[in-house]
Interface confidence: low
Amino acid sequence: DTHKSEVAHRFKDLGEEHFKGLVLVAFSQYLQQCPFEEHVKLVNEVTEFAKTCVADESAENCDKSLHTLFGDKLCTVATLRETYGEMADCCAKQEPERNECFLQHKDDNPNLPPLVRPEVDVMCTAFHDNEATFLKKYLYEVARRHPYFYAPELLFFAARYKAAFAECCQAADKAACLLPKLDELRDEGKASSAKQRLKCASLQKFGDRAFKAWAVARLSQKFPKAEFAEVSKLVTDLTKVHTECCHGDLLECADDRADLAKYMCENQDSISSKLKECCDKPLLEKSHCLAEVENDEMPADLPSLAADYVESKDVCKNYAEAKDVFLGMFLYEYARRHPDYSVMLLLRLAKAYEATLEKCCAAADPHECYAKVFDEFQPLVEEPQNLVKQNCELFEQLGEYKFQNALLVRYTKKVPQVSTPTLVEVSRNLGKVGAKCCKLPEAKRMPCAEDYLSVVLNRLCVLHEKTPVSEKVTKCCTESLVNRRPCFSALELDEAYVPKAFNAETFTFHADMCTLSEKEKQVKKQTALVELVKHKPKATKEQLKGVMDNFAAFVEKCCKADDKEACFAEEGPKFVAASQAALA
């Protein structure tokens, strides 16, 4: 469907509000260090230009591609060279190389201050004084910190953000109303960002075949009553949407996502009985709801898979004729029967099946060769089942904080070269799997846990790619997307690691510890724990527990003291000396 003016087409399809929001997100994700006012100026200029093209599609420059228009606009920023260094070199390139260059300079860990939440009254005043600027600021601040955030979904978060302020700034107790809502949005937003980052990594590092395989498995679990052709159509459209968003084509992505939601709602009967309540909602809410919709019930009369995929004499003929389609159908059939399996496990099974067919279809007696293929799946299935069982037992025994600490020790021993802040962030998030998944019924534990771990480990991979320090991490991250988690699980203590020299400064604490929130205190203690393990990688659990218990007691004692700083100055060196002795 070709249009004389792409920018006019998208403006008309999306409407001014969404158009401006998406352009602001796009610019903020590319130029993450630019001040808010600069971005607003650029967005207003692009919007005015788009309006001239809507009025006359033949007007000058209206026929240019969106990449050309947006890239030209970004390259007008005066401080590009000073602020971004070599990213400014992108502007010397032609499209499509220029956009690729901007994409490569997206920073997953930008050097930006953490967002501080002002007092509720201050926020409510700002909201009432200029609602539009307040909401743009939200889009800008989230987008620049999360350069791969799923843009149409960020518009949905902004709508919820607006609704929270509209409701709570009128309430008798503004804080009691607003703060839980903001906490929820923050936590959901971080989770959404991390999930989308995995989708983009899957597309960018492993290609659209990998993403399509993931989508076939997930959508077949969600829509087990849908036929394969229907699932295929949804997968193709979903792949297009995410390819666009991950590639910075946010207007096309949002437009195509809206079309996909429309298609799904018009074809509910052939997709899922669970879509109805989503389809009554407005666009942003509808798309979100469809993405999160629960699995439909499995058809009651599904036959055994063995007939078509093991017992049939035509397996090799069917496989040879259209390999991807045959494997896609296998994955579809397996996934719709197994909502209790993680997507990653299903993909491992499909990979194992493919490897067996590649080997057996070249053998003298193919049928004899692949007859036991389903038996080979058993260890692949049992590995994540056992992992989830063991870790949930540990979580229930220790509670979240101590479970995180156990994972911190485990992962620091596996990959001690990784930076301490990264190990703390990743291990804390790995530890959240307990509260998120272990309370679920057995049939939902594995998909919850393993697919969540895949998202968290992708964050480790993304951060490590920026500053590679460990060959083991590189190997686990790059060899196979579906085997990342088993690869990390299988890592042992790094025997080649030279322990970090002891640095007393790392273990010196001050009275400011006492004013920290509970979460910040935990992070401080966990940072110290990682440093301890880096110093003594072979320390036993008991030794580390003893040091951490002493640490907690020392901090508690000094925070109760009249002269807190004096207590830290006096007790700190004693704690350090005792810790060194305990770990000797």
Epitope: R209, K212, A229, S232, K233, V235, T236, D237, K240, K317, N318, E321, A322, D324, V325, G328, M329
Partner: nanobody, 124 residues
């Protein structure tokens, strides 16, 4: 470069049948997935049916399932679409398409070559 030429369209009454043909030239026909798409006046092009290289896999849109049948004859480099129990809403320009590397048969942008279309009008 594959050339595709559709034929067999026409004006029929509701409930009637038609058989569309699509003759291919310029490529190794048996290596292509073949598909039929249609576009009604003022509407977007939509998937109708597709068939794999050796006719093992066939796909149909829900709206035509049970009424339309796709087939191919690799020796004649031709793909067919049998249209039965035609309805007024089947009125459209029917396009034949060929794809060398498609994984998923239902998306028009995965097809590399297209015919000019043959018009089917169902009217009483």
């Amino acid at each position: 470069e594959v050339q595709l030429v559709e034929s067999g369209g026409g004006v029929v009454q509701p409930g009637d049948s038609l058989r569309l043909s699509c003759a291919a030239s310029g490529g190794t026909f048996s290596t292509y997935v073949m598909g039929w798409f249609r576009q009604a006046p003022g509407k977007e092009r939509e998937f109708v049916s597709a068939i794999s290289q050796n006719s093992i896999h066939t796909y149909y849109a829900n709206s035509v399932k049970g009424r339309f049948t796709i087939s191919r004859d690799n020796s004649k480099n031709t793909v067919y679409l049998q249209l039965n129990s035609l309805r007024p809403e089947d009125t459209a320009l029917y396009y034949c398409a060929a794809s060398r590397f498609t994984s998923w048969y239902t998306a028009d942008y995965e097809y590399d070559y297209w015919g000019q279309g043959t018009l089917v009008t169902v009217s009483s």
